[in-house]
């Protein structure tokens, strides 16, 4: 008799693919563009990336470290209006693209939630949620949490406005804090609360610490769901050199949780690289002529449109990631297994029940290794097989599909692999 | 600054085993790498291999997995390299050398070197 | 596992005068990921242990005097001393960094005249 199946864990849309952040609307489209109007023309892009959710703004009014002149009810004119809002909320459904606004009250100032009043603003937060559910937004986001007194119990009582009004809403806190301990205190009281943080920042771009790190995160939350990025909104290429982006992006979409990116991390957009361009929300490269400022400055592989033709690009790899995470049962809610596999080196297994099975190997290291892969740190139902199919690589070069020997796995520096093997009873 | 301590010298029998040491000093020990490197008298250098310290994961040449193992102690900063069932091709300097992976990945700082004879 | 041939295994100079050296891998050492080459000179002076001098194949470790250059690219290297001194008397090894095994050429001897 063939095995009873695995019953499928209960998902929602968040659980089933990445998020994208869009902090900056002028800055995501360019050209002196920027409003709401704007943006609904991208969603057939945001579409192409096969991310589930746009988290969008602060989009609000906010009069700089001015309480009385904040107004989260009321769309800033520069952004568009609430039609404009509510046009992009209907558009954004029929794509299937969730959104999410981020309610952070002071975003103009100094201090997120002003340095005074902290009761004024946690009411404007309260009413803010109600309006704004009302209005379809399918979850919220607020960051800077370390900078509001009481964290814990206002994200309590926002998690219960957005969960009374429907448990398919979602509620984002976002902190800059990268201490374990911190993160688990806001989410010990808050038991559905997506949180993003600074806590993989920290990761030294090693293969031995990110590992740590990983396992730690996952040991200290349980079976809770997590989210992954590197921090609550500034771009991979603020905290990774370029060689180790695509490895990132592979190690985020095949973790257990949900991956959140910022606009600009699909095609590696860089700050550094854009002269006078602001760190934390530079122009997004559309294509050449998205940053006129230094003729020649952008070259087209650098850019949207260049990478879209090119299938051995950053932008390639994140949309074919982007598809594999949102379609496959084990990476979608598959069990986690890291295991060793030599020095540098991250390797776990994601398996659910008789479902394909997924292996990844990252090499963090700037040297070429041969990986040692001990499966006997893994249980039974974790088992690997002789020989993996590669399904991708990060690097080019390497024949895809084809059955590699795991006795005999060596990887590039700085390469990670996708490898996929059958469950076998 | 950045030092790496080894014993001068070592005088084994043949047969027996030896433990090198390699103290670490004037840098977090667990953010690099050790390597090591064997050099027999009047010839060139041959990597042995290499082990992080801040899980102890080590990976060895082919041509060294019978005859080496590497181990380190974080509590002191010191990397270990033992050598088994010694002969007379074991009687070489062994060099410890910091591996720095992250950045580019070469050997920025060498110890001093331990010699080790083999003798009856 | 990447062989590395070294030539010639000695020469003798004068102090002042230009010296190179020729390093060779049995496959290519350049990453196309960032577009370097994983090859690494090091200087052995006798009774010495090695010191580091380039990498990446002509980034000059800090504190190495500029008369020390490396190039080349794929399979290609050189490491060139622009103006030989009496102290410049050492061996001198390449080493690929690419890919374990790490493995070093035969090393060149330099002696002055």
């Known amino acids: 008799r063939a095995p009873r199946c695995r019953e499928l864990p209960a998902q929602k849309w968040w659980h089933t693919g990445a998020l994208y952040r869009i902090g900056d609307l002028q800055a995501f489209q360019g050209h002196g563009a920027g409003n709401l109007a704007g943006l609904k023309g991208r969603l057939d892009y945001l579409s192409s990336l096969k991310v589930k959710g746009l988290v969008l703004g602060p989009i609000h009014k906010n009069q700089k470290d001015d309480v009385a002149q904040t107004d989260l009810l009321q769309i800033d004119p520069n952004f568009g209006s609430k039609e404009d809002f509510d046009s992009l909320l209907q558009s954004a459904k029929k794509k299937s693209i969730r959104v999410i606004l981020d309610l952070t009250p002071n975003y103009r100032g100094e201090n997120s939630w002003f340095s005074t009043q902290v009761d004024t603003v946690a009411t404007k937060v309260k009413d803010a949620l109600e309006f704004w559910l009302q209005a379809g937004v399918d979850g919220f986001q607020v960051r800077d949490i370390e900078n509001l007194k009481d964290a814990s119990s206002f994200l309590a009582e926002w998690q219960n406005i957005t969960k009374g009004f429907s448990e398919d809403r979602l509620l984002i806190a976002g902190t800059n804090s990268s201490d374990l301990q911190q993160i688990l205190s806001l989410l010990e009281s808050n038991k559905d609360l997506l949180l993003t943080s600074s806590y993989l920042s920290d990761s030294g771009s090693t293969g031995e610490h990110t590992k740590s790190l990983v396992t730690q995160y996952l040991n200290a939350t349980g079976n809770r769901w997590c989210s992954w990025s590197l921090s609550q909104a500034r771009l991979l290429t603020s905290f990774l050199p370029a060689q180790l982006l695509r490895l990132y992006q592979l190690m985020l979409f095949t973790l257990p949780g949900t991956p959140v990116f910022s606009y600009g991390d699909e095609i590696g957009l860089d700050a550094a690289a854009l002269p006078g361009q602001p760190m934390e929300a530079p122009v997004m490269l559309w294509d050449e002529s998205s940053f006129p400022d230094i003729p020649g400055a952008v070259s087209a592989n650098m850019t949207v449109k260049g990478q879209s033709e090119d299938p051995g690009s950053l932008l390639s790899l994140f949309r074919r990631l982007s598809d594999q995470r949102s379609k496959e049962r084990s990476l979608l809610h598959g069990d986690f297994h890291a295991f060793s596999a030599g020095p540098g080196l991250f390797s776990y297994i994601r398996h659910w029940d008789q479902n394909e099975r997924f292996l990844v190997v990252l090499n963090f290291g700037d040297v070429g290794l041969s990986a040692g892969l001990q499966a006997s740190d893994l249980p039974a139902s974790a088992s690997l097989p002789a020989k993996a199919d590669l399904l991708l690589s990060t690097q080019p070069g390497r024949e895809e599909g084809s059955p590699l020997e795991l006795e005999r796995l060596k990887l590039e520096p700085h390469e990670g692999l996708l490898l996929r093997f059958p469950y076998a009873a | 600054q950045v030092q790496l301590q080894q014993p001068g010298a070592e005088l084994v029998r043949p047969g027996a085993s030896v433990k090198l040491s390699c103290k670490a000093s004037g840098y977090t020990f667990t953010s690099y790498w050790m390597s090591w490197v064997k050099q027999r008298p009047g010839q060139g250098l041959e990597w042995i291999g290499f082990?992080?310290?801040?899980?102890?994961?080590?990976l060895y040449s082919q041509m060294f997995k019978d005859k080496a193992t590497l181990t380190v102690d974080k509590s002191s900063s010191t990397a270990h390299l033992q050598l088994s069932s010694l002969t007379s091709e074991d009687s070489a300097v062994y060099y410890c050398?910091?591996?720095?992976?992250?950045?580019?990945?070469?050997?920025?700082?060498w110890g001093q070197g331990t010699s080790v004879t083999v003798s009856s | 596992d990447i062989v590395m041939t070294q030539s010639p295994s000695s020469l003798a100079m004068s102090v002042g005068q230009k010296v190179t050296m020729s390093c060779k891998s049995s496959q290519s050492l350049l990453n196309s990921n960032n577009q370097k080459n994983y090859l690494a000179w090091y200087q052995q002076k006798p009774g010495q242990s090695p010191k580091l001098l380039v990498y990446f194949s002509s980034t000059r470790e800090s504190g190495v005097p500029d008369r020390f250059i490396g190039s080349g690219s794929g399979t290609d290297f050189t490491l060139t001393i622009t103006s030989v001194q009496a102290e410049d008397l050492a061996d001198y090894f390449c080493q690929q960094h690419y890919s374990t095994p790490l493995t070093f050429g035969a090393g060149t001897k330099l002696e002055i005249k």
């Open positions: 082990i992080t310290p801040s899980d102890s994961e080590a």
């Open positions: 050398a910091r591996w720095s992976y992250g950045n580019f990945a070469a050997m920025d700082y």
